[in-house]
Amino acid sequence: CKAMHVAQPAVVLASSRGIASFVCEYASPGKATEVRVTVLRQADSQVTEVCAATYMMGNELTFLDDSICTGTSSGNQVNLTIQGLRAMDTGLYICKVELMYPPPYYLGIGNGTQIYVIDPEPCPDSDF
């Protein structure tokens, strides 16, 4: 019996508008009906929560209104989008999956996605 595996891409480049998207996929050891997905940022051995959402299997996952994350779910796959990123937000973003219900609870953690964010160059003043 293998432990729950969570897969996510190794590297993602954010768009010029500071938006990064990646897929977090997990192999479930049980028949979970309630799943919690958390995005955590790891920097200098400090881990901080970026956003979290709980969803019922078959339903959409919803983040809090003030969250910088949005996402959609399909089976054991979650498509995550993080918005409002700046160059200083470049770092390792870890997908954590918890099978919350029914018991038993299971924990799965991805290896992390290195998100690179490059601030756009300011537009030069036009001289017409």
């Epitope: 432990a3 790891q42 881990v47 901080t48 918890e98 038993p104 609870y105 924990l107």
Partner: antibody, heavy 119, light 107 residues
């Protein structure tokens, strides 16, 4: 810094009830799973229960299922353990512990509170 | 439920000795394995988390290894303050079981 302080322990007769509290400070309480772990005199550590984040999901050890209820008040940063139908074998030091935000290890523990069930 | 076993249950060692404690899970727990040290009358103290990561402030003579079902805690050179009981614990699935403990005392 993270601080966990338990209270509510004492001597109680078999079949009676007791409620333990754990006051937390120094971190965003609602972002963490909170646990109770106990240790009977001269014995090893036994995980008792966990309550997750918003309090909607709880899991228990078989030895306390149906008798103990874990709860939390995120507005007060406080964790509780309601213990009903107490038995002699529930005699132990009860610790509250914070599960790590990433892998769930117990990096922070309370000092423990003793519950003695005796007639 | 995942059962955790530890060996030995107790050991006698001298200051400066290299000490190895093993922990085995009844099924794969990936790297969700933690090690704690406990002294009489005190709360447990985290030493190693995620099988091999050293907790901040813990001396480097402590190290952990393993994944899946087999794990090891090593104390490279036992110090007087290391005489205590050591527990492994899995944080992969409920119930979050502990091993029965290994008591390290003075030879």
């Amino acid at each position: 810094q993270v601080q966990l302080v338990e209270s509510g322990g004492g001597v109680v007769q078999p079949g009676r009830s007791l409620r333990l509290s754990c006051a937390a400070s120094g971190f965003t309480f609602s972002s963490y799973g909170m646990h109770w772990v106990r240790q009977a005199p001269g014995k090893g550590l036994e995980w008792v229960a966990v309550i997750w984040y918003d309090g909607n999901n709880k899991h228990y050890a078989d030895s306390v299922k149906g008798r103990f209820t874990i709860s939390r008040d995120n507005s007060k940063n406080t964790l509780y353990l309601q213990m009903n139908s107490l038995r002699a074998e529930d005699t132990a030091v009860y610790y509250c512990a914070r599960g790590d935000i990433l892998t769930g290890y117990y990096g922070s523990w309370g000092q423990g509170t003793l519950v003695a069930v005796s007639s | 439920d995942i059962q955790m076993t530890q060996s030995p249950s107790s050991l006698s060692a001298s200051v400066g000795d290299r000490v190895t404690i093993t922990c085995r899970a009844s099924q794969s727990i990936s790297s969700y394995l933690n090690w704690y040290q406990q002294k009489p009358g005190k709360a447990p103290k985290l030493l190693i988390y995620a099988a091999s990561s050293l907790q901040s402030g813990v001396p480097s003579r402590f190290s952990g290894s393993g994944s899946g079902t087999d794990f090891t805690l090593t104390i490279s050179s036992l110090q007087p303050e290391d005489f205590a009981t050591y527990y492994c614990q899995q944080s992969y699935s409920t119930p979050f079981t502990f091993g029965p403990g290994t008591k390290v005392d003075i030879k």
